[in-house]
């Protein structure tokens, strides 16, 4: 007869091992008791369990409540045990050994291998801003036996750096991804991509970039000067610029303070019928916390009056 | 031949505590198994727990938890603790040996009285 068995038994952390040892006896050929018992080298052989044809199973106190039989139907030549709610400590070697009757004993080994699946984390790098240099993003770290794979999925361009710490019984990777810092990315998504044989499907970590900056500052309705008369209504100034975070706004008159009637509504500076008294300088201030920029205009609120006068000057000139 | 000799039977109350020693003599080389069984008046000797060479142990669901066997194989002795005794596990004890060549209990002593009552 021969026994048969595997080479390696794989199993994830917390599953149950299926050991298995199956004697293909001749005709006429018994089991009388299979004995399972973990061999690791340098250490002497310490006993598992014994299944006995008559008696049944015998667990050792070490592995109490932790070593079965497969459920029924079982074969008598099937000395398979179940290892239940594996741990890396369980990673090694095991022989099981069946004495048989009349042909005598026969062993074989195997090796098992306990997958620890990856826990990863990821930690954002220092704040990003615009005009910065290459600057650490994100970092990856996840651990796990055997050592798991981390990379990145991103449209961002930038550099990653890897390194590896080995443990007695894991392996914890860290990646980091760098870059050079620029508005475009921006709510950009940046995702950790830990792969690992105990893992069904590959864990993702998406970080979202948030680069700091703050636009110049121009400003909108001047485009047309004659539309500033005297009596319009309606007129507005408004400041345009984008930055992270939001930029505040905050409107001033150069050469004094604001006319009355006025009206300030964030970004917008809203002018009731214009008069004469509305001509000045006037300043769009934009802030946030990573920078400020200004902007100013000369609004010149013309009279039709004197204009139409000239008008006639020049005609009658010409 | 295995020559296996008891000791350590006798009355104790319920809920109390005995340890019976089981030493072996002879060709002990041979031994596989060992085990204590129990014969209760009228009723049949039943398995109550074993050990093997490696030291793996099988109780009876009835002493699971209360029993507990041990081997000291410098001693060629098996031990047998009993805490938590209940009158139903008044009996006569046996030790009892498994050949390596018949895998069955063929080797026995000669049986120590447990009683538990108050």
């Known amino acids: 007869g021969e026994l048969e068995t595997s080479d390696v038994v794989t199993v994830v952390l917390g599953q149950d091992a299926k050991l298995p040892c199956f004697y293909r006896g001749d005709s006429g050929e018994q089991v009388g008791q299979v004995a399972w018992a973990r061999v690791d080298a340098g250490e002497g052989a310490q006993e598992l369990a014994l299944l006995h044809s008559k008696y049944g199973l015998h667990v050792s106190p070490a592995y109490e409540g932790r070593v079965e039989q497969p459920p029924p139907p079982r074969n008598p030549l099937d000395g398979s045990v179940l290892l239940r709610n594996a741990v890396q400590a369980d990673e090694g070697e095991y022989e099981c050994r069946v004495s048989t009757f009349p042909a005598g004993s026969f062993q074989a080994r195997l090796r098992l291998r306990v997958l620890v699946p990856p826990l990863p984390s990821l930690n954002p790098g220092p704040a990003l801003e615009e005009g910065q240099g290459l600057t650490l993003a994100a970092s990856c770290t996840a651990e796990g036996s055997p050592a798991p794979s981390v990379t990145w999925d991103t449209e961002v361009k930038g550099t990653t750096s890897s390194r590896s710490f080995k443990h007695s019984r894991s392996a914890a990777v860290t990646s980091e991804f760098h870059l050079v810092p620029s508005r475009s990315m921006n709510g950009q998504p940046l995702t950790c991509v830990v792969s690992h044989p105990g893992l069904l499907q590959d864990q993702r970590i998406t970080h979202i970039l948030h680069v700091s900056f703050l636009a110049e500052a121009s400003v909108r309705g001047l485009e047309d000067q004659n539309l500033w008369h005297i009596g319009r209504e309606g007129a507005m100034l408004k400041c345009l610029s984008e930055g992270q975070p939001p930029p505040s706004y905050n409107w001033t008159r150069l050469d004094g303070p604001l006319p009355s009637g006025v009206r300030v509504d964030g970004d917008t500076l809203g002018f009731p019928p214009l008069t004469t008294e509305h001509s000045g300088i006037y300043v769009c201030h934009v802030s946030n916390e990573f920078s400020s920029r200004d902007s100013q205009v000369t609004v010149d609120v013309l009279d039709p009056q004197e204009d139409s006068g000239k008008q006639v000057d020049l005609v009658s000139a010409s | 031949e295995v020559q296996l000799v008891e000791s350590g039977g006798g009355l104790v109350q319920p809920g109390g505590s005995l340890r019976l020693s089981c030493a072996a003599s002879?060709?002990?080389?041979?031994?596989?198994?060992m085990g204590w069984f129990r014969q209760a008046p009228a009723k049949q000797r039943e398995l109550v727990t074993s050990?093997?060479?490696?030291?793996?142990?099988r109780y009876a669901d009835s002493v699971k938890g209360r029993f507990t066997i041990s081997r000291d194989v410098s001693k060629n002795t098996v031990y047998l603790q009993m805490n938590s005794l209940r009158a139903e596990d008044t009996a006569v004890y046996y030790c009892a040996a498994e050949s390596e060549r018949t895998y069955y209990f063929d080797s026995w002593g000669q049986g120590t009285q447990v009683t538990v009552s108050s």
């Open positions: 002879g060709s002990i080389s041979s031994i596989n198994l």
């Open positions: 050990i093997s060479p490696g030291g793996s142990v």
